[in-house]
C-alpha cells in the first residue's frame, strides 16, 4: 500500500538508505511530500518485521517499485491507493 501523509511534523528521516529491500519484506510505503516543515520529500518503508527504513527518493529501485504499485492500483481500482492523512 502506498500512503501519502500530510502531517504537521518536521522531517521524520535523519538518514536515508539506498539499499534494496525486496517487496516480500515490505508492509507499506509511506510518502511524505516536501512541505509541512520539511525541506525534502521523504519515503519511509515499513517492513514486515516491524522495522522502519527511510529510503532515498532518488534510489532507482524505490522509484521502479512505486511506479509498479501506481500502475497496479490504477488498473484495478477507480482511484489510486493513496491514503492521505490531513491533520
Amino acid at each position: 500500500v502506498l500512503e501519502v501523509y500530510y502531517t504537521s511534523l518536521r522531517c521524520r528521516c535523519v538518514q536515508e538508505s539506498s539499499v534494496f529491500i525486496p517487496r516480500r519484506f515490505i508492509d507499506r510505503i509511506q510518502i511524505l511530500p516536501r512541505g509541512n516543515g520539511c525541506p525534502r520529500k521523504e519515503i519511509i518503508v515499513w517492513k514486515k518485521n516491524k522495522s522502519i527504513v527511510c529510503v532515498d527518493p532518488q534510489a532507482e529501485w524505490i522509484q521502479r517499485m512505486m511506479e509498479v504499485l501506481r500502475k497496479r492500483s490504477s488498473s484495478t481500482l477507480p482511484v489510486p491507493v493513496f491514503k492521505r492523512k490531513i491533520p
Epitope: R10, C11, R34, N36, C38, P39, K41, Q58
Partner: antibody, heavy 119, light 107 residues
Framework: QVQLVESGGGLVQPGRSLRLSCVGS????????MSWVRHAPGKGLEWVSA????????YYADSVKGRFTISRDNSKNTLYLQMNSLGAEDTAVYYC????????????WGRGTLVTVSS | DTQMTQSPSTLSASIGDRVTITCRAS??????LAWYQQKPGKAPKLLIY???SLASGAPSRFSGSGSGTDFTLTISSLQPDDFATYYC?????????FGGGTKLEIK
C-alpha cells in the same frame, strides 16, 4: 530550457512597499517549488522565502517574516514577492529560483532584480 | 537555526592547483548540503547537492564530500573559469541557511 525572469525592482523609500514578479518558462510551473534568494551588496547569499507548487505551503526567513509575502499564479506562470515595511537592510539583488524535485536546492536561477531601499 | 561557517573566507590559488573549501554546520545535517558558485554580477549556479552529487552541467573537476557537520568542496585542477565565490547551503531544516562564502582569487 528553463527560464526565470524577474521584474519589479527599483528604488524605494524606507517603510514603503514593492512587489517583485518572476515569470517561469520551459518547465511545468505548477508542479515546481519556487523560492526567492537575495544577495546584499558586499554580503553573502540569504534565503528569503519558498512556496510549494500549489501555493499551499510557504516558508520565510526570520528576517522577513511578517513583512514579506510569497505567492504565485500558476495560470500566469508567475511567482510574486510582496515586500512591505522595507528597510535599508532589504537592499539586495533578489533572485527567483526553481528548486530541484523533492529538495530545497535551487537548481535554476533568474538573473535577479535589484531592490534599493534609500531615502 | 542551523549556522553555516565557511573557511577560508578568501583563498588565493593558481591554475592547475587542487583547491579545498570547508563548510561547517552548527549541528548535524547528515548530507543535506549544496554548493553554489557565483561570479560578480551573475546569478549563482548549483554545483553539488546531497553533499556529493554533481549537479547537471557542473564540471567533473568539482566534487563534494562530508556528512554530519563537516563538508568540503574540492576542485581537482583549477581552471581560469573557476575564480568566483563559493557558497554552501544546508537544507536539513527551515530556515534554509547559507555559509558566508569563500572568494577564490588568482594568486
Amino acid at each position: 530550457q528553463v527560464q526565470l525572469v524577474e521584474s519589479g525592482g527599483g528604488l524605494v523609500q524606507p517603510g514603503r512597499s514593492l512587489r517583485l514578479s518572476c515569470v517561469g518558462s520551459g518547465f511545468t510551473f505548477g508542479n515546481s517549488w519556487m523560492s526567492w534568494v537575495r544577495h546584499a551588496p558586499g554580503k553573502g547569499l540569504e534565503w528569503v522565502s519558498a512556496i510549494s507548487g500549489s501555493g499551499g505551503s510557504t516558508y520565510y526567513a526570520d528576517s522577513v517574516k511578517g513583512r514579506f509575502t510569497i505567492s504565485r499564479d500558476n495560470s500566469k506562470n508567475t511567482l510574486y514577492l510582496q515586500m512591505n515595511s522595507l528597510g535599508a537592510e532589504d537592499t539586495a539583488v533578489y533572485y527567483c529560483t526553481r528548486d530541484l524535485p523533492g529538495i530545497a536546492v535551487a537548481g535554476y536561477w533568474g538573473r535577479g532584480t535589484l531592490v534599493t531601499v534609500s531615502s | 537555526d542551523t549556522q553555516m561557517t565557511q573557511s577560508p573566507s578568501t583563498l588565493s590559488a593558481s591554475i592547475g592547483d587542487r583547491v579545498t573549501i570547508t563548510c561547517r554546520a552548527s549541528e548535524g545535517i547528515y548530507h543535506w548540503l549544496a554548493w553554489y558558485q557565483q561570479k560578480p554580477g551573475k546569478a549563482p549556479k548549483l554545483l553539488i547537492y546531497k553533499a556529493s552529487s554533481l549537479a547537471s552541467g557542473a564540471p567533473s573537476r568539482f566534487s563534494g564530500s562530508g556528512s554530519g557537520t563537516d563538508f568540503t568542496l574540492t576542485i581537482s585542477s583549477l581552471q581560469p573559469d573557476d575564480f568566483a565565490t563559493y557558497y554552501c547551503q544546508q537544507y536539513s531544516n527551515y530556515p534554509l541557511t547559507f555559509g558566508g562564502g569563500t572568494k577564490l582569487e588568482i594568486k
